[in-house]
Structures are given as structure tokens and as C-alpha cells.
């Protein structure tokens, strides 16, 4: 087979300068990038600006409060999470513009690409720890009366972030920057190389232990306590659980066309046609993921909202409200009763 | 038909630069890029680097970015490298080649005859 | 750099045999665009290499088609289905994906 049958291919105007026409492909299509690309452009600037923004006010609200309160300490190390991630967006963005060239260097490769997944693994592993909470102040109030405490909250938080991390090192450890002959190009990725088993098997941790098996005990561990809530007319408020239900719920949606991608890339032919459009997606399906670094703070404000009727209060007391709420009778009039039952609500504040 | 054709056998001694040649006819020297390629006595083939005529941009293995020095002169259609603070390792024979491909200049299709550098005192 | 591995190093041969010359590369050659840029080159005694495979499997013009390419990703492998005379010399494989280019160490051909 001969495709050589041409007479002048003049590659000149691939470079003449370092970095190339590096907006040049080389199928020679136009400089424009595709639409998939221009979407997450999109979006990661709007998670950049709300994420930045609303997490940094979280924070600052909740850190406050979170030396007593509870609620705060979760919601605290969900929107530090959050922030970090949204940290390293401008230079995703970048990228992104430059084509997926990446000018940043190996340690930049490593690092900013696995905060995402160091987010991922750290707010699931927190909204699981959330939820073991919210079980226990529903099926074990007595026991939270004893032992729930904020010494615990952090412990629990410093065993999520542990764990967070020690998930992510296989991304970390196999992130490289290879760099293209032509047209030149310098690429920021994981390269299992040798090791299909390897990237298979990251791949299906990732998906479980980050995505199917939270997804199955957080829906049976709000099942039971919305049985229950919603079986007692005493309970006043679910404002918490309302919140903490659509943080998870959005946790999944934005999550699963990442999951998708990645499981099927890891099965896939790197030359495959099927594997070439997923790649061309990957920056489309890690924006979307990227959204739940800037969904929380909305969803609190939202929730804010909804239980003030308008937006009276100033930002950061809605926020407060929504965030500091214990799950507890409290003597200040910015807390208000919960899912726990009666008998629960009967205990000190923690 | 298409021809590259090196400059002669060269000795030089150690410290000092010499330049070889590489002339190129028939195609249009300006349209395809020109690699050079090490290959020490019996032992495998080693990229120096390419340089595209039309615009004297050059990209070099980082072991030779001090070493090579690549140039190309489009009245007369001939490529050159320039060695430079030579020692007994830089005995080899230096090819030129052409690259091509159709999505991009990926092969090289025609290669000089080699010019052989010895490096004595 | 890329580490392109040949195997073996010297293959002994009678004329009609078959053989076929391994070349494992240390990272991944799938280039971003889909293809992979790994090529064949023969290098008989005196001359320079020319260029037979390229692009894992295409015979370049003229190639005779006794020589096939094959594998993906990091493992190659060159095919002669029946050895000739003027099949004799060195073997090399080489990659254009990434920067440095780089060549096996050769795989010389010689009559057994």
C-alpha cells in the first residue's frame, strides 16, 4: 500500500516559531477547536468564577462556626476540597486554548490534573461520612448524644482526606508529559504503556470505590432515614437533609459521564475510532465533572432561599444558616431542629 | 530524480568544528524538512535533529543541542551541520534524510550516502 | 526518551525462511491523532537505510509485499515470509511520534 503518490507537502507552516502553529492539527483542519472543547471552555470558566467565589464564602462561614458546630466542619472540608480543585483550572483552561498543549512541565502534569480526582475521592468519601451522620442522628440518637462530637467530625475528616489521597497516587504516579514530533506538541497524560491490566484496574477502583459502591450505600442510607423522617410527623425540619441529599444527588449526575469515559478508554484500542472520540469528549466530560466544585455553594444558597422565602439576609448569614444549622435544639434562634427525633432533639448542643 | 548528496570524508581533530553539507535536487528543497542522523562505527542510529528549509526552524535531540548546529542555504539548495567542539565520540557516520508523509513528515523516504567524520589528533 | 528494544540482535537465516523481528518501544506510540508513527528501515552493508514499513504496516513504494508490519501500542513486529539474498543486512525499527526520534539497536540478517 503507497500513499506517497504527491509531489510538494510543505509542512512549513507548522512552525517557524517554538510552539508551532500549534493551532494547525494535523489533519489540517481549521484553527478552531472543537466544539466539545469550546463547551468545557465554557464551563470551566463558569465553574472557576462560582467556584472560587462561593466556596471561598463557605469557608469563611463555616469556619467560624466550626469549631462547634458539626454541620460546619463537613461542609468546611467539602468547600476547601472544592476550592482547591477550582485552583487549577486556569491552567487546564489554558491548555485547553493552546490545544491541549501543555507548557506547564512534568510537576504541573502530575500534580493539577490529579486535584480533580484528589476532589472526587475527598467529597465523596466526606458526603459518605456526612451520611453516616445523618443515619446515626436518625437511628442512634442516643449514641450521638454521647459520643458525637467535633474531635470525632475531624478525625473523620482527616481519615477521608487520607484516604482521598492515597486513591489518587496511581493517577499521580502515572501522569506524564510526552512531547509530539510533529506537529510539536508537549502533552500532559497518564501512559500505562505496557500495563493495559494496570489502567483497567485503576480504572474500575475509580469507578467503584468513587462512584458505584458510594452511589449504592448513600441511596440505601438515605432511604432509611427518609422512611423514617417522613414516618414521624414530629420532625420539624429537613433543611440538612434536603441539602445534603441534592449535594449527593449532583455528585452522581456530574460524575457519571467521566465514569463512563474512562471505564470504556481503559477497554478501548488507543487507535480505536470509538477510543478517539472519547479522548476528543475527555475535556467536555472532566468540565462537567468539575461542575460539583461550584454546585455546592449554589445548592446552599438555593436551599437558603427556599427556607427564607426571599433573599433578605446578606449572603453569608443565608449561608450560615443553611451550613451552621446543628441537628440539635440550640438557645440561638439561627439553628433549627432537624431530622432527628424527638427524643434526639431533647439532647445538648455538640 | 530525488537526491541528497553529502559532502566527502572529513578528519578533524579534537576541539576543532567542521561542517558538512548536504545538497538536495530534484523536488522543491524548501517544501520538505531535512533530518540529520548519527550512526557510530557498528552500533545503532541516533537523531540529531531537522531543520526546515523554508523557514530555518530547528528542533534538536537535547544530547546534541550543544554539539549540532543545523543551517540551510535556499539559493543553493543544500542543508549543513556544524559540529562543533569535537571528540573522539563524534566519530561516526552523519546522514541526511528527507521526511515525508501524508498527514505529516513523519518517514524519512530518502537518506545521503553518508558522510564519514573521523576525529584523530 | 523513548527506548526502542529490538529482538533478537543477530538472526541467522537460510534463504525461504520465514522470520520475524520483535521491537518493543518504552512508552506508547499512539500519537494524539490516532495513528502510530513506528517505522521499519533496512540497512544493507556500505549503503544507507531505506525505508520499508511505515506507519506499523504499510509497505513503502516499491517494498516487495513478502515484508509485513504489525502490533500496536508498544509492541511491533516485523514479518519476511520468505528470506532472499537481497534481504540480508540490518534492521531497524524506529519511532517519529515523539521527541527525541529514536531507533532499535538494529537486528543484523545473515545467511546461517
Known amino acids: 500500500m503507497n500513499s506517497f503518490n504527491y509531489t510538494t507537502p510543505d509542512y512549513g507552516h507548522y512552525d517557524d516559531k517554538d510552539t508551532l502553529d500549534l493551532n494547525t492539527p494535523v489533519d489540517k483542519t481549521s484553527n478552531t477547536l472543537r466544539v466539545p472543547d469550546i463547551l468545557a471552555l465554557v464551563i470551566f470558566a463558569v465553574v472557576f468564577l462560582v467556584g472560587v467565589l462561593g466556596n471561598a464564602l463557605v469557608v469563611w462561614v463555616t469556619a467560624f462556626e466550626a469549631k462547634r458546630t458539626i454541620n460546619a466542619i463537613w461542609f468546611l472540608n467539602l468547600a476547601v476540597a472544592d476550592f482547591l480543585s477550582c485552583l487549577a483550572l486556569p491552567i487546564l483552561f489554558t491548555s485547553i486554548v493552546q490545544h491541549h498543549h501543555w507548557p506547564f512541565g512534568g510537576a504541573a502534569c502530575s500534580i493539577l490534573p490529579s486535584l480533580i480526582l484528589l476532589n472526587m475521592y475527598a467529597s465523596i468519601l466526606l458526603l459518605a461520612t456526612i451520611s453516616a451522620d445523618r443515619f446515626l442522628l436518625v437511628f442512634k440518637p442516643i449514641w450521638c448524644q454521647n459520643f458525637r462530637g467535633a474531635g470525632l467530625a475531624w478525625i473523620a475528616c482527616a481519615v477521608a482526606w487520607g484516604l482521598a489521597l492515597l486513591l489518587t497516587i496511581p493517577s499521580f504516579l502515572y501522569r506524564v508529559v510526552r512531547e509530539e514530533y510533529f506537529p510539536p506538541k508537549v502533552l500532559c497524560g497518564v501512559d500505562y504503556s505496557h500495563d493495559k491490566r494496570r489502567e483497567r484496574a485503576v480504572a474500575i477502583v475509580r469507578l467503584v470505590l468513587g462512584f458505584l459502591w458510594p452511589l449504592l450505600t448513600l441511596t440505601i442510607c438515605y432511604t432509611f432515614i427518609l422512611l423514617r423522617t417522613w414516618s414521624r410527623r414530629a420532625t420539624r425540619s429537613t433543611k440538612t437533609l434536603k441539602v445534603v441529599v441534592a449535594v449527593v444527588a449532583s455528585f452522581f449526575i456530574f460524575w457519571l459521564p467521566y465514569q463512563v469515559t474512562g471505564i470504556m478508554m481503559s477497554f478501548l484500542e488507543p487507535s480505536s475510532p470509538t477510543f478517539l472520540l472519547l479522548n476528543k469528549l475527555d475535556s467536555l466530560c472532566v468540565s462537567f465533572a468539575y461542575i460539583n466544585c461550584c454546585i455546592n455553594p449554589i445548592i446552599y444558597v438555593v436551599a437558603g432561599q427556599g427556607f427564607q422565602g426571599r433573599l433578605r439576609k446578606s449572603l453569608p448569614s443565608l449561608l450560615r444558616n443553611v451550613l451552621t444549622e446543628e441537628s440539635v435544639v440550640r438557645e440561638s434562634k439561627s439553628f433549627t431542629r432537624s431530622t432527628v427525633d424527638t427524643m434526639a432533639q431533647k439532647t445538648q448542643a455538640v | 530524480q530525488v537526491q541528497l548528496q553529502q559532502s566527502g570524508a572529513d578528519l578533524a581533530k579534537p576541539g576543532a568544528s567542521v561542517k558538512l553539507s548536504c545538497k538536495a535536487s530534484?523536488?522543491?528543497?524548501?517544501?520538505?524538512?531535512i533530518h540529520w542522523v548519527k550512526q557510530r562505527p557498528g552500533q545503532g542510529l541516533e537523531w540529531i535533529g531537522y531543520i526546515n528549509p523554508r523557514g530555518d526552524y530547528t528542533k534538536y535531540n537535547q544530547k546534541f543541542k550543544d554539539k549540532a548546529t543545523l543551517t540551510a542555504d535556499r539559493s543553493s539548495s543544500t542543508a549543513y551541520m556544524q559540529l562543533s567542539s569535537l571528540t573522539y565520540e563524534d566519530y561516526a557516520v552523519y546522514y541526511c534524510?528527507?521526511?515525508?508523509?501524508?498527514?505529516?513528515?513523519?518517514?524519512?523516504?530518502?537518506w545521503g550516502q553518508g558522510t564519514t567524520l573521523t576525529v584523530s589528533s | 526518551d523513548v527506548v526502542m528494544t529490538q529482538t533478537p540482535l543477530s538472526l541467522p537465516v537460510s534463504l525461504g525462511d520465514q522470520v520475524s523481528i520483535s521491537c518493543r518501544s518504552s512508552?506508547?506510540?499512539?500519537?494524539?491523532?490516532?495513528?502510530?508513527?513506528l517505522q521499519w528501515y533496512l540497512q544493507k552493508p556500505g549503503q544507507s537505510p531505506k525505508l520499508l514499513i511505515y506507519?506499523?504496516?504499510n509497505r513503502f513504494s516499491g517494498v516487495p509485499d513478502r515484508f509485513s508490519g504489525s502490533g500496536s501500542g508498544t509492541d511491533f513486529t516485523l514479518k519476511i515470509s520468505r528470506v532472499e539474498a537481497e534481504d540480508l543486512g540490518v534492521y531497524f525499527c524506529?519511532?517519529?511520534?515523539?521527541?527525541?526520534?529514536?531507533f532499535g539497536a538494529g537486528t543484523k540478517l545473515e545467511l546461517r
Open positions: 512508552q506508547s506510540l499512539v500519537h494524539s491523532n490516532g495513528n502510530t508513527y
Open positions: 534524510a528527507r521526511v515525508t508523509g501524508t498527514e505529516g513528515p513523519y518517514y524519512f523516504d530518502y
Open positions: 506507519k506499523v504496516s
Open positions: 524506529s519511532q517519529s511520534t515523539l521527541v527525541p526520534l529514536t
Open positions: 530534484g523536488y522543491t528543497f524548501t517544501s520538505y524538512w
